[in-house]
């Protein structure tokens, strides 16, 4: 009986339904390729339920396998622009703790102006995800063109 | 004991597992950029479990955070075709109720013939999702090239 | 009481949380367009929880609706290379049992060097998924550039 009752009383977060969808806040200074994210209902349709933002980077609060997804669109971009400024590359990875640093997802824009992808990956409490955009083109800040999110899938 | 028993008796839909995967039915008349979708086992591998179709547009039946995904491929397309007829753009958004109208996901084809993306977004019961394809190229109706779906993720 | 207790004792797999994320092992011999996959913690961040590998192809162990996702990047590729070697196409499908053979997801590279997509599809125990890469370019074996996975979503 206790387990059934406990289930009724547990907040959603304790069921492992950690999820976040972020919108672009700003890019870093010149030598910092990281994108800085923001989230919360006041900003539109972005949110954090479980994970947190640490100086614009996403920090995981629950161990598990996550679906990580991202879309980045380059600002004022045409296929000509994109090819001229090649290579522009986006990489999503664990950037801290340093001992767990690894690239999880990498895409180049080539002659396109948008990249979008997703993957399943194990993440641990305390992992911070960074999204590095290398190249001389700026990402669009439109919330329907550039976004980044994670979804807890299973322990 | 009641909760455990109730769980055993509840249909899947009541657990919040709403999900749909749709295939292209047809495009709209010239001044209507919307794509019209269809779904159901008789049509192949498309289905609706929870959400419904309203005149070819997807209507949400349960509040929650959803993973929305889409792939659209242009018919008889090469990179030359795609670049010549730029801009061809796909946007997924809430089109009704009007008070909640917003673009959720937007991609341009540039020199490519396929776009594919996904995002997490809060949706409410009664929200209708529209997929607008602007441009003068037709979307492929092949079920492995063009599809649109949603998956309930959490309340 | 029994159901609640049973829930506590059931392994995750019995809850239907089947999930796999694979990395590229190798390509097939010349006349075989299939990509051969591998997975497991010893290899990095790939894993199989439920599904199994059968000679490098992914075999499903539980009926249900799955989210299938894939990213493939071509090795030593530029937009010039990609367009010159066009058409390079990736298709994900059920390849056995033969009675259920069908293409689920298809993308061409055109002038790009990466394709990434995802879709929801019903799969049955025993279905084997094959990923066919046609063309004369090799896929990258970098684990952040080429990967393939499935996630059980609902019965």
């Amino acid at each position: 009986q206790r387990f059934a009752q406990a289930q009724q009383q547990l907040p959603l977060e304790s069921l492992g339904w950690d999820v976040a969808e972020l919108q672009l806040n700003h890019t870093g200074p010149q030598q910092d390729p990281r994108l800085y994210w923001q989230g919360g209902p006041a900003l539109g349709r972005s949110f954090l339920h479980g994970p947190e933002l640490d100086k614009g980077q996403l920090r995981i609060h629950r161990d598990g396998i996550y679906m990580v997804h991202i879309q980045v669109t380059l600002a004022i971009c045409s296929s000509t622009t994109a090819s001229r400024h090649h290579p522009t590359t986006l990489a999503v990875g664990i950037c801290s703790p340093a001992s767990r640093s690894i690239s999880l997802l990498r895409l180049s824009f080539h002659q396109g102006c948008t990249i979008a992808s997703q993957r399943l990956t194990p993440l641990a409490r305390g992992d911070t995800l960074c999204t590095n955009l290398t190249g001389t083109l700026l990402p669009s800040r439109n919330t329907d063109e550039t976004f980044f999110g994670v979804q807890w899938v299973r322990p | 004991q009641r909760f455990a028993q109730a769980q055993q008796q509840l249909p899947l839909e009541s657990l919040g597992w709403d999900v749909a995967e749709l295939q292209l039915n047809h495009t709209g008349p010239q001044q209507d950029p919307r794509l019209y979708w269809q779904g159901g086992p008789a049509l192949g591998r498309s289905f609706l479990h929870g959400p419904e179709l309203d005149k070819g547009q997807l209507r949400i039946h349960r509040d929650g955070i959803y993973m929305v995904h889409i792939q659209v491929t242009l018919a008889i397309c090469s990179s030359t075709t795609a670049s010549r007829h730029h801009p061809t753009t796909l946007a997924v958004g809430i089109c009704s109720p009007a008070s909640r109208s917003i673009s959720l996901l937007r991609l341009s084809f540039h020199q490519g013939c396929t776009i594919a993306s996904q995002r997490l977004t809060p949706l409410a019961r009664g929200d209708t999702l529209c997929t607008n394809l602007t441009g003068t190229l037709l979307p492929s109706r092949n079920t492995d090239e063009t599809f649109f779906g949603v998956q309930w993720v959490r309340p | 009481q029994r159901f609640a207790q049973a829930q506590q004792q059931l392994p995750l797999e019995s809850l239907g949380w089947d999930v796999a994320e694979l990395q590229l092992n190798h390509t097939g011999p010349q006349q075989d367009p299939r990509l051969y996959w591998q997975g497991g913690p010893a290899l990095g961040r790939s894993f199989l929880h439920g599904p199994e590998l059968d000679k490098g192809q992914l075999r499903i162990h539980r009926d249900g609706i799955y989210m299938v996702h894939i990213q493939v990047t071509l090795a030593i590729c530029s937009s010039t290379t990609a367009s010159r070697h066009h058409p390079t196409t990736l298709a994900v499908g059920i390849c056995s049992p033969a009675s259920r053979s069908i293409s689920l997801l298809r993308l061409s590279f055109h002038q790009g060097c990466t394709i990434a997509s995802q879709r929801l599809t019903p799969l049955a125990r025993g279905d084997t998924l094959c990923t066919n890469l046609t063309g004369t370019l090799l896929p990258s074996r970098n684990t952040d550039e080429t990967f393939f996975g499935v996630q059980w979503v609902r019965p």
Partner: antibody
Framework: QVQLQQSGPEVVRPGVSVKISCKGS????????LHWVKQSHAKSLEWIGV????????DYNQKFKGKATMTVDKSSSTAYMELARLTSEDSAIYYC?????????????WGQGTLVTVSA | DIVLTQSPASLAISLGQRATISCRAS??????????LHWYQQKPGQPPKLLIY???NLESGVPARFSGSGSGTDFTLNIHPVEEEDAATFYC?????????FGGGTKLEIK
Amino acid sequence: QVQLQQSGPEVVRPGVSVKISCKGSGYTFTDSALHWVKQSHAKSLEWIGVISTYDGDTDYNQKFKGKATMTVDKSSSTAYMELARLTSEDSAIYYCARRGYYDYDWFPYWGQGTLVTVSA
Amino acid sequence: DIVLTQSPASLAISLGQRATISCRASKSVSASGYSFLHWYQQKPGQPPKLLIYLASNLESGVPARFSGSGSGTDFTLNIHPVEEEDAATFYCQHSRELPPTFGGGTKLEIK
């Protein structure tokens, strides 16, 4: 409404060239490519080629390469086709045509045709 | 190039009856879930007029007595009931690839 107005009939001697025109009106000229089609008794309808009214890019039917040259003048919303080294085989009605809304080559809009007669 | 073969070359149909014209392609003109095959009507001294596009779609302003069907390599234009003003030559055309080609034409005469 969309209109394609072609130049008048031409009677020309063998071996010379002729340049015929097609002026578009009732729509944004640079929005849609223009196609040229030949109609003769011997060969029914034959597609000659297409020219982008936006940037002048062309695609020719292999059979008409060296015979036809398509050009465009955006300022006057006019497309031209020059036929070189004329022979009796080139005697035909030449139509310009335009696609409809979708960018695939079927033709709801046609010019009235230009009759070219090659005669000594 | 894709060759389109029309049959018959000519036919005479009584007023109110059904006219059926066939168009066969040397290879499939279907792709991406569409059939890129179109039908035109041409009367003497006039340019061709589009009747049907993508095998079965009626062009705006064309009477509903015209209908098209088929996929792959075999296509049909039906006119029912035939009216006096339908006397003309009918052409099929594909746009599956460059160059687009036309059928040889079918001349419809009203008896």
